[in-house]
């Protein structure tokens, strides 16, 4: 015997004990799939959450985080405080990155600078709390007699003295 409740569309619920009529979800509730026996209460975006998409009888509300916070977890289940670039969030709040580490985002942890020497390269630009180091050519590439990464200077035309 086919379950008549399976005919009930999203936005309705079916009470099997009654006439198997699909009744509309009550206010502030939804069913996003058909054949539901109950409707779910809409998510409320309060406090550090703000509404990105209103709830409807067929779909739940979607939340974002208010300014100064960012989403964590599936469907923005949590809001975490933003820090500045060059900082990370600890139990005691935002703390500057330790020397040798950086964070170029408002979220996440401080990560160690790249160790250029592991790739046989040298440090071209020093790292900061906000930026990773920039690795350049290896020290061997910069030694006398080695081919340079810079192109040779153009040859002077004959008969012209240097300016």
């Amino acid at each position: 015997l086919q379950d008549l409740c399976s005919n009930c569309p999203a936005g309705t619920f079916c009470d099997n004990n009654r006439s198997q009529i699909c009744s509309p979800c009550p206010p502030n509730s939804f069913s996003s799939a058909g054949g539901q026996r109950t409707c779910d209460i809409c998510r409320q975006c309060k406090g550090v959450f703000k509404t990105r998409k209103e709830c409807s009888s067929t779909s739940n509300a979607e939340c974002d985080c208010i300014s100064g916070y960012h989403c964590l977890g599936a469907e923005c289940s949590m809001c975490e405080q933003d820090c500045k670039q060059g900082q990370e969030l600890t139990k005691k709040g935002c703390k500057d990155c330790c020397f040798g580490t950086f964070n170029d985002q408002k979220r996440g942890i401080c990560r160690p600078w790249t160790n250029c020497s592991l790739d046989g390269k040298s440090v071209l630009v020093n790292g900061t709390k906000e930026r990773d180091v920039v690795c350049g050519p290896s020290p061997a590439d910069l030694s006398p007699g080695a081919s340079s990464a810079t192109p040779p200077a153009p040859a002077r035309e004959p008969g012209h003295s240097p300016q």
């Epitope: 569309p9 936005g11 309705t12 009654r18 509309p24 502030n28 409807s56 009888s57 067929t58």
Partner: antibody, heavy 114, light 106 residues
């Protein structure tokens, strides 16, 4: 701001037909079921018809079954009520209502009389 | 069909008075909604699923009940509360409204 604006009411002869419309704005119309509810002069409220968000489920009050047809055009955010074989007892203010019953239109008056 | 009977049909109350409107159903319903209709305007949702206040509704309104008996209470009546009040159920088809209670302010 959520708005429901009904139109199409007026004076109709008994046995005649009329089509009411309800223009919705300010919310995701295609995500909500919709009702028509009516109120006869100096009387209470009476549920008339319901249509689910995707039009797959439709119900009518016994008093209008076989004479009224509810439909919707989601791309145009519009709800309709086609009424035929009208009787004097269909005289009422007709409201379009979101399925949560939290928003009602201002209503359109239908008078069935000779 | 489930018939909803509201009582009293007309009620007169003084400002500041606490009043209770009742709605009884001929069969058990899962929950009840209440709407308010002021003269010449559309109805407005007041209480949903028995006891939840709709958006923007003052906290002096409250709802309770279960099964076949539900009530709406106004803890301290104000002049702006003069209106018709309807209970309605949307769980058992056909969906029905009560006959209404007219609240007059003395």
């Amino acid at each position: 701001d959520v708005q429901l604006v009904e139109s199409g009411g007026g004076l109709v002869q008994p046995g005649g037909s009329r089509k009411l419309s309800c223009a919705a704005s300010g919310f995701s119309f295609s995500s909500f079921g919709m009702h028509w509810v009516r109120q006869a002069p100096e009387k209470g409220l009476e549920w008339v018809a319901y249509i689910s968000s995707g039009s797959s489920t439709i119900y009518y009050a016994d008093t209008v079954k076989g004479r009224f047809t509810i439909s919707r055009d989601n791309p145009k955010n519009t709800l309709f009520l086609q009424m035929t074989s009208l009787r004097s007892e269909d005289t009422a203010m007709y409201y379009c209502v979101r399925d949560w019953t939290d928003y009602w239109g201002q209503g359109t008056t239908l008078t069935v009389s000779t | 069909q489930i018939v909803l009977t509201q009582s009293p049909a007309i009620m007169s109350a003084s400002l500041g008075e606490e009043i209770t409107l009742t709605c009884s159903a001929t069969s058990s319903v899962s929950y009840m909604h209440w709407s308010q209709q002021k003269s010449g305007t559309s109805p407005k949702l007041l209480i949903y699923t028995t006891s939840n206040l709709a958006s923007g509704v003052p906290s002096r309104f409250s709802g309770s009940g279960s099964g076949t008996f539900y009530s709406l209470t106004i803890s301290s009546v104000e002049a702006e509360d003069a209106a018709d009040y309807y209970c309605h159920q949307w769980t058992t088809y056909p969906w029905t409204f009560g006959g209404g209670t007219k609240l007059e302010i003395k």
